[in-house]
Amino acid sequence: MGRARDAILDALENLTAEELKKFKLKLLSVPLREGYGRIPRGALLSMDALDLTDKLVSFYLETYGAELTANVLRDMGLQEMAGQLQAATHQGSGAAPAGIQAPPQSAAKPGLHFIDQHRAALIARVTNVEWLLDALYGKVLTDEQYQAVRAEPTNPSKMRKLFSFTPAWNWTCKDLLLQALRESQSYLVEDLERS
């Protein structure tokens, strides 16, 4: 996933704090194509531009994610920005027809660990959290942290709580989480590694 994701991120990073807030609120009510779910309000409102980009791409894929972002920007009166987003998305011959997902391109950020790079997608898509916690317990998670994550009611909130501890982790600790994810959610990791 390359050009479209970067174009979405560029657009969102160019919004003021007030505009970003307005964007999120409009995203909660914008009409969606049949078959696509809405990003949960609780998760949405606390996201920064980077998290929101990851969430848009993980929920809607790149092509539709960019189209949706442009629609919301247009609805906010930011026609020029919407036009720039769509132009960036359709540059060259890399554009796929509407509704068709272009083949993914590598856009890995060299300085970021997989865990940080895909934070939003992992929060949204990891299901087997209990096993992850057991795999990490005593290695990177204290008893107190383990209990705190388990106490959360949903998988996304569990993952969000788990991510609240990762800023203190070094690369090796994050590798342990990645390894546990590989073992318990192999298809998800393979999917994200391509992005």
Partner: antibody
Framework: EVQLVESGGGFVKPGGSLKLSCAAS????????MSWVRQTPEKRLEWVAT????????YYPDSVKGRFTISRDSAKNTLYLQMTSLRSEDTAIYYC???????WGQGTLVTVSA | QAVVTQESALTTSPGETVTLTCRSS?????????ANWVQEKPDHFFTGLIG???NRPPGVPARFSGSLIGDKAALTITGAQTEDEAIYFC?????????FGGGTKLTVL
């Protein structure tokens, strides 16, 4: 280049056993989920088993649960399918596949008949 | 147990664009179903075309693309060629099991 090469197929009587192997190359075998899929004589594709990267998580359809066991040896880059209590309806071409990326082997024929 | 449904047969002409779809009985297909598309040519020769909804393995022609359209997974062949005449199977992952569709027989004439 990803390559998957199956072996171990053959003719077996009902109630018998057979072990299939799949030699994988061209990718980091230990990082990926692997599966067995079969094509029945009626040309249907049926999923048979999946094993996640670490070998801890294995999944089977009810039709083979308790009779078939999927395993992997990451040191040898090899996937296995141990089949026991074979039935005539297990007759099929068995394919080793990395479905997350859509890579398939050439298949090995298993015939179960009296 | 989920049921995965494909068109039983489609016909197209060389150079035309054709879209095959894959529907789930449980609701909308999402990226978490990791839609997989495989082509079967005569003599049980299978070639994986798409994995993880939209990922094309190396060596697969660029005319094949995968996507989600509406509530279904889709395989689009842009500029079909006579050698694309084959049976196309899709498979969807449901958290702990794969389910294959019955296949679409594509005729190119």
């Amino acid at each position: 280049e990803v390559q998957l090469v199956e072996s171990g197929g053959g003719f077996v009587k009902p109630g018998g056993s057979l072990k299939l192997s799949c030699a994988a190359s061209g990718f980091t075998f230990s990082n990926y989920a692997m599966s067995w899929v079969r094509q029945t004589p009626e040309k249907r594709l049926e999923w048979v088993a999946t094993i996640y990267s670490g070998g801890i998580f294995t999944y089977y359809p009810d039709s083979v649960k308790g009779r078939f066991t999927i395993s992997r040896d990451s040191a040898k880059n090899t996937l296995y399918l141990q089949m026991t209590s074979l039935r005539s309806e297990d007759t099929a071409i068995y394919y080793c596949a990395r479905l997350g990326g859509s890579y398939w082997g050439q298949g090995t024929l298993v015939t179960v008949s009296a | 147990q989920a049921v995965v449904t494909q068109e039983s047969a489609l016909t197209t002409s060389p150079g035309e664009t054709v879209t095959l779809t894959c529907r789930s009985s449980t609701g909308a297909v999402t990226t978490n179903n990791y839609a997989n598309w495989v082509q079967e040519k005569p003599d049980h020769f299978f070639t994986g075309l798409i994995g993880g909804t939209d990922n094309r393995p190396p060596g697969v022609p660029a005319r094949f693309s995968g996507s989600l359209i509406g509530d279904k997974a889709a395989l689009t062949i842009t500029g079909a060629q006579t050698e694309d005449e084959a049976i196309y199977f899709c498979a969807l992952w449901y958290n702990n099991h794969w389910v294959f569709g019955g296949g679409t027989k594509l005729t190119v004439l």
